[in-house]
């Protein structure tokens, strides 16, 4: 389970309410740190192990998830075609 414990407002850009969120996540046995719906989350460790990143549902609802080549990360494709790429070190 994760909860937002701090929301840092970006005052220089008023239309962007929250620039950064700090989450506190307490993972259960068999879970480790991941991303779900573009937020920090605890996910099944087997997803991380097998690098099936899209199984943790990392993209926002309505976006499409695809694995990068060599499973080095994933892309989230918005309905308009914009692509966000996340690589895992």
């Amino acid at each position: 389970t994760c909860e937002v414990i701090a929301a840092h407002r970006d005052s220089s850009q008023p239309r962007r309410t929250i620039a950064r969120q700090t989450a506190r996540c307490a993972c259960r046995k068999g879970q480790i740190a991941g991303t779900t719906r573009a937020r920090p989350a605890c996910v099944d460790a087997r997803i991380i192990k097998t690098k099936q990143w899209c199984d943790m549902l990392p993209c926002l609802e309505g976006e499409g998830c695809d694995l990068l080549i060599n499973r080095s990360g994933w892309t989230c494709t918005q309905p308009g075609g914009r692509i966000k790429t996340t690589t895992v070190s």
């Epitope: 996540c25 307490a26 068999g30 740190a33």
Partner: antibody
Amino acid sequence: AVTLDESGGGLQTPGGALSLVCKASGFTFSSHGMFWVRQTPGKGLEYVAEITNDGSGTNYGSAVKGRATISRDNGQSTVRLQLNNLRAEDTGTYFCARSTYECPGGFSCWGDTGQIDAWGHGTEVIVSS
Amino acid sequence: ALTQPSSVSANPGETVKITCSGGSYSYGWFQQKSPGSALVTVIYWDDERPSDIPSRFSGALSGSTNTLTITGVQADDEAVYFCGTEDISGTAGVFGAGTTLTVL
């Protein structure tokens, strides 16, 4: 190099208490779940206790539940096992171990017995009158 | 409880397979040359090998059974091999009783 150094073993009396300490070095201690595992003459390897990377969660094996307390000091890179009401069957070698997964900041993570990648040399405990 | 064979034997150069089943999450394999002596992880997280462990050691998971394979076994590999994982309920760690590997 990752090193885990246990201390505090020795001859103990039945009904007494012992405190074992594991001093860690060579890695970011606060990011890893830690374990105590023992090897007793009659039972092979036995899970004793574990603690999450941030110390917020603890778990104990059935043989020591109610008698054991595991704690950690991330500032000192130490993990401690307190065992009370000692019995003869607590005799054995006690090992400190590290779970390999490096938990990122903002997360509290358990270790996994199958992910133990480093062990201490062990400290011998003998419970006898 | 985990199930692993109590003993296996092989000639130098042969391939040895030791199985472990009955757990959940991930499996590790731990080598011990004599009782009470140091434990050495040869495989962790199903198939990961520490950098100082020879490549002849490998691990593979199939369902809830993990297999430790030693390809081209050497005299120095003679030891007891314990498997470790979480119990089926995922509430505590559990270890196998150990498999004694004898190199003939």
